[in-house]
Structures are given as C-alpha cells and as structure tokens.
Interface confidence: medium
C-alpha cells in the first residue's frame, strides 16, 4: 500500500540535491584556501541532519547549528554587501570587486544558493515532490530557516560601512518582509556598524528620479537611525556602466555620475 505523503504548495527538493551540495562544497574548498580544512563529508552530514526525518514545518535555527559551526568563516567585516530583490547584479559586482562579499560568496551561502530541500517526519527520505511554501504552508520550513539563520549571522558579523543593493524597479524598493528587511536590518550591530549605505539600482534607461527619496527608503532610514546607525543612499542610474566602471575605474567616462 503506498504510504500517504504530505502534499505541500511549494516545489520539491531540487533534483540531485545531495550531489549538488557535495560538488559545491568540494569546489568551494578547492578555490578558497582558507576553507581547505573543511571536510565536505561532515558538511553534508550536518546539512542532512538539519532536516532529514524532521517535520518540514517544525525546523528551528538550532537544527542548523552543527552546519553553522562547520561553515564558520571569517570574511572582512567591512566588506559586506547585502542585497534585496537584485541578487544577480550583486553577484556580478562581487565577481568584479573581489574584496567584497555577499552571503552567497561564503561557503554556506554558496552551498544553498537557488536550491530547495525538505524531508519528511520520521523517514530518512528527501521529498522531491513538494516542500512547504513560506506563505501558503509554514514559515519554519528547512529553506526559510536556513536563510534566516545564515542571514542573521552574516549581518551580525558586519562592521564599519555596510552596503546594500536595492532594486529601484520594484514598487517596494525596501520591503520590510524581505530577508534584508526582516532579518539583516535588525541584526546589524550598532556598536560595530557605523553606516548603512544603500545603492538603489535604477531599471529604466531614462529614469532620472532620485529614488533615495522614495517613501520606503525613508522608512529604511528611520529604522536604521533608530538603531543608532547612520544611513546614506546613492542612486545607481546606469547599472551596466556602474559594473563597467568597477572593472575599469580609469575609464574617462567613469568620472561622470553613474
């Protein structure tokens, strides 16, 4: 008799999930000498242990602690780039500006980027059919709890000037419900972080508005100021030119506003 299986609203575990996590771990530790000591077998065991045989709506940050411990990594605390709803450009930026880091440039962020995973209560199976959706099913699912945990730790580690890239094409440029708005903003440490500098990325070619005056940006400024952290904001009118000028700062066209 086929066993009844919980049907969730979200997509199931990414195909070849174990192999992908392992492959990414091996690749990352080969490329980053400071992480060569990491044993990818132990990393996989800790990752698996966080969600296998557990109810996928009952995952806690505590479940991920063994993985967090294994993935402990020191990144320069004054070179952190947060992002919200504009991941691709943030990643393109840190690929060029190699001394800056997004969460996905760290081992744990890199392992899980773009992946979905969940298990089933009381079985050692990975559920490839469906996983809980954050809105429709539950927020304490394996993926959401993972990102909440690593995002909190990443924000807590930041110091000096922290940058955040925001998507100026969205109706809510700053969204309180995003990971940045709900987790990272509230875990920046005022005793370490002097300034949060927002880069608002413009979508339209002819968009010359000052999006730093957007009501949601003012809301972000208010939240940050109340936490005794200074706030500054810059419009990035031409993201393509911005990346080009990061690559070639000597270019004569890079002295004008981007």
């Amino acid at each position: 008799v086929p066993r009844w299986r919980q049907q969730w609203s979200g997509p199931g575990t990414t195909k070849r999930f174990p192999e992908t996590v392992l492959a990414r771990c091996v690749k990352y530790t080969e490329i980053h000498p400071e992480m060569r000591h990491v044993d990818c077998q132990s990393v996989w065991d800790a990752f698996k242990g966080a969600f296998i045989s557990k109810h996928p709506c009952n995952i806690t940050e505590e479940d991920y602690q063994p993985l967090m411990k294994l993935g402990t990594q020191t990144v320069p605390c004054n070179k952190i780039l947060l992002w919200s709803r504009i991941k691709d450009l943030a990643h393109q930026f840190t690929q060029v500006q190699r001394d800056m880091f997004t969460l996905e440039d760290t081992l744990l962020g890199y392992l899980a980027d773009d992946l979905t995973w969940c298990g089933e209560f009381n079985t050692s199976k990975i559920n490839y059919q469906s996983c809980p959706d954050w809105r429709k099913d539950c927020s304490n699912n394996p993926v959401s709890v993972f990102w909440k945990t690593v995002s909190r730790r990443f924000a807590e580690a930041a110091c000096d000037v922290v940058h955040v890239m925001l998507n100026g094409s969205r109706s809510k440029i700053f969204d309180k419900n995003s990971t940045f708005g709900s987790v990272e903003v509230h875990n920046l440490q005022p005793e370490k972080v002097q300034t949060l500098e927002a880069w608002v990325i413009h979508g339209g070619r002819e968009d010359s508005r000052d999006l730093c005056q957007d009501p949601t940006i003012k809301e972000l400024e208010s939240i940050i100021s109340k936490r005794n952290i200074q706030f500054s904001c810059k419009n990035i009118y031409r993201p393509d030119k911005f990346l080009q000028c990061v690559k070639n700062p000597e270019d004569s066209s890079c002295t004008s506003e981007i």
């Epitope: 070849r16 174990p18 192999e19 992908t20 392992l22 492959a23 990414r24 771990c25 091996v26 690749k27 080969e30 044993d39 990818c40 077998q41 996989w44 773009d114």
Partner: antibody
Framework: QVQLVQSGAEVKKPGSSVKVSCKAS????????ISWVRQAPGKRLEWMGW????????TYVQKFQGRVTITADESTSTAYMELSSLRSEDTAVYYC??????????????????WGQGTLVTVSS | EIVLTQSPATLSASPGERATLSCRAS??????LAWYQQKPGQAPRLLIQ???TRATGIPARFSGSGSGTEFTLTISSLQSEDFAVYYC?????????FGGGTKVDIK
C-alpha cells in the same frame, strides 16, 4: 596530489565479465566522484558512468545500463568497474578519472582530472 | 545527447607555429566545455576547463575561447611536446560527451 593507479591488462572471452580496479591516494577519496571512461581503438573517448563514494550513488550512461556496475571500497580508497556480457567491440582502454568541479551556476561542471594510467581490456575468442 | 564535432581531424604544423583547433557542439552548451591533451600510450590530461580557464600547471601558450556552440583551443607557439591528440568534452548535459579529436602532428 591525487594519484589514481589502475589494475593490469586483461584478456577476456566474449560473454564473460571483467572487473577493473582504480586505487586513489593523496586525496579525500570519499567526497569526489570517480568516473570511468573508455577508449576503443580509433574511437572517441566515451564516458560510462560514475560513483560518488560518500553517497554510494552511481550514474550509468544508458548505453551501458545493465552491463556495467561501478562500486567503491572506502576502506581501501578503491573504485571498481565491472563490465559483463563482453563482446569484441568492448575491446578498449578503460580509464578511471576523478571528477574535478568547474564553474556552473547551478551544478558545477564535471571535468576529469587526474586520470588513471588506463587498463587495456581485450575481448577475443 | 550532445554531439561534439572537432576540426580539422589532423593539423600539420611546425614548431613555433600557431595552432587553432575547433570544437562545435550540436546545441548550445554555454561555456561548459573542456579541452584535453593525449599523447600516445598515455591517459588524457586536462588543459582547459569552463571554456577558457587553464588547468593547474598548464603553460600560458594554451588558451581556450568560445561559448554557445563554437569553441577554439589555441596553442600560440607549438613546442615539440605539444604534438598530440586534443579532445573537447562538454559538461552541459548528461551524458558527458567528447569530441572525436584533432591530431596535431609535425609538418
């Protein structure tokens, strides 16, 4: 530095089986995939499949499905490839190779580095 | 499966000359291509991965380029030890497949 050392040449009769070994040294055997690639005389290199020792999972190319079995012994850091129901066209040099991960936005690319020295399997009546 | 076609089948050149080898994929494979060198009686050796990244210890005279369906391996100045067979391999899609090879021999 990882090194892969394969077992010696074999001469087999049609219909029989052959088992080739590949011993790894100088690296973390369990976390890497070990692939098997063959090269028949005058033919292109042909990927047969692989094993990921940490999971014990295997992937076989459809052409070899049902005839090839890839296994690994973690205790001796050795991978094995067994090919059954041998025919003359299976005469080839069989290589094991460790999978090296390259770039790739989702699943890192799979390249082969390093390779074993190769094992010549001759199928003849 | 993705078919890789290499050309020319044989390239005759002299030491010091520039050699350009081509690999064409039957469908787009992004930059998911590698090049190997194989000398008689030896196993293949990884030269280039991810279309253009030289593998560890590979001399700078070897370079790779291309994306999509057209790829090139260039040897800027052939040395005596470079006369060998060169294979391309794709990792975009399973099964992983190799090209038929280009033999670079001495003119």
């Amino acid at each position: 530095q990882v090194q892969l050392v394969q077992s010696g040449a074999e001469v087999k009769k049609p219909g029989s089986s052959v088992k080739v070994s590949c011993k790894a040294s100088g690296g973390n055997f369990i976390s890497y995939s070990i692939s098997w690639v063959r090269q028949a005389p005058g033919k292109r290199l042909e990927w047969m499949g692989w094993i990921i020792p940490i999971f014990g999972t295997t992937t076989y190319v459809q052409k070899f499905q049902g005839r090839v079995t890839i296994t690994a012994d973690e205790s001796t850091s050795t991978a094995y490839m067994e090919l059954s129901s041998l025919r003359s066209e299976d005469t080839a040099v069989y290589y094991c190779a460790r999978v090296k991960y390259g770039s790739g936005s989702y699943y890192p690319n799979n390249w082969f580095d390093p390779w074993g020295q190769g094992t010549l399997v001759t199928v003849s009546s | 499966e993705i078919v890789l076609t290499q050309s020319p089948a044989t390239l005759s050149a002299s030491p010091g000359e520039r050699a350009t080898l081509s690999c064409r994929a039957s469908q787009s494979i992004s930059s998911n291509l590698a090049w190997y060198q194989q000398k008689p009686g030896q196993a293949p050796r990884l030269l280039i991965q991810d279309s253009s990244t030289r593998a560890t210890g590979i001399p700078a005279r070897f370079s790779g380029s291309g994306s999509g369906t057209e790829f090139t391996l260039t040897i800027s100045s052939l040395q005596s030890e470079d006369f060998a067979v060169y294979y391309c391999q794709q990792s975009d899609n399973w099964p992983l497949t190799f090209g038929g090879g280009t033999k670079v021999d001495i003119k």
